[in-house]
């Protein structure tokens, strides 16, 4: 059974994941982002179901494509490079879903834009956090 300290740790990790996903979305949604139109042409796979931590496998499998799209920003100055963000997200995702469990991700038939993709995983984090508090 999960202890209160392990629940607290899970909640904190989910909050950190949520914050970085939101920040990426902030950057993409920035109306001054000249690469937004190009970014929106890339398609992401969405999970058929995302209600448990094991479903983060579906996010993990899309992190490389996400990094590639973020690299399109090609800012002359990154505070955080896409690889810094994706590396941190990957560490959090691995800790949350556990590396022992082998879960085969099932994807929805319809693909999504980067904005829809990020919003889906932001909603996932918020939903799981709400069950922990």
């Amino acid at each position: 059974a999960p202890t209160s300290s392990s629940t607290k740790k899970t909640q904190l990790q989910l909050e950190h994941l949520l914050l970085d996903l939101q920040m990426i979305l902030n950057g993409i949604n920035n109306y001054k982002n000249p690469k937004l139109t190009r970014m929106l042409t890339f398609k992401f796979y969405m999970p058929k179901k995302a209600t448990e931590l094991k479903h983060l496998q579906c996010l993990e499998e899309e992190l490389k494509p996400l990094e590639e799209v973020l690299n399109l920003a090609q800012s002359k100055n990154f505070h955080l490079r896409p690889r810094d963000l994706i590396s941190n997200i990957n560490v959090i995702v691995l800790e949350l879903k556990g590396s022992e469990t082998t879960f085969m991700c099932e994807y929805a038939d319809e693909t999504a834009t980067i904005v829809e993709f990020l919003n889906r995983w932001i909603t996932f984090c918020q939903s799981i956090i709400s069950t922990l508090t």
Epitope: L17, K32, N88
Partner: nanobody, 119 residues
């Protein structure tokens, strides 16, 4: 509008340590990047280190292994622990706040704090 208040600069001998702090207040996004940049006389401003509210970090190659950036999300404060300081670390250190991972004109900058490394 975001206000940034820096502290912790000063004069230190080579090999010494300093800890910089920067507190942000005002219209703060919960998801943001805070970081430190520096500008030495006659040189361009350069990134030292940055950290997101989710814990993602980026360090300049020249400070890796010597400087550590951390933050307290509850206090909207970022810290830069600087160890094994070298004369070439001498510069004005500026705190930065951004709502995105890349620099743009919506970013906010502190007034700067002087760090001098000299014997």
């Amino acid at each position: 509008e975001v206000q940034l208040v820096e502290s912790g600069g000063g004069l230190v001998q080579p090999g010494g340590s300093l800890r910089l702090s920067c507190a942000a207040s005002g219209s703060i996004f919960s998801s943001n990047v805070m970081g430190w940049y520096r500008q030495a006389p006659g040189k361009q401003r350069e990134l030292v280190a940055a950290i997101s509210s989710g814990g993602s970090t980026n360090y300049a190659d020249s400070v890796k292994g010597r400087f550590t950036i951390s933050r307290d999300n509850a206090k909207n404060t970022v810290y830069l622990q600087m160890n094994s300081l070298k004369p070439e670390d001498t510069a004005v250190y500026y705190c930065a706040y951004a709502s995105s991972f890349y620099e743009d004109e919506t970013d906010y900058w502190g007034q700067g704090t002087q760090v001098t490394v000299s014997s």
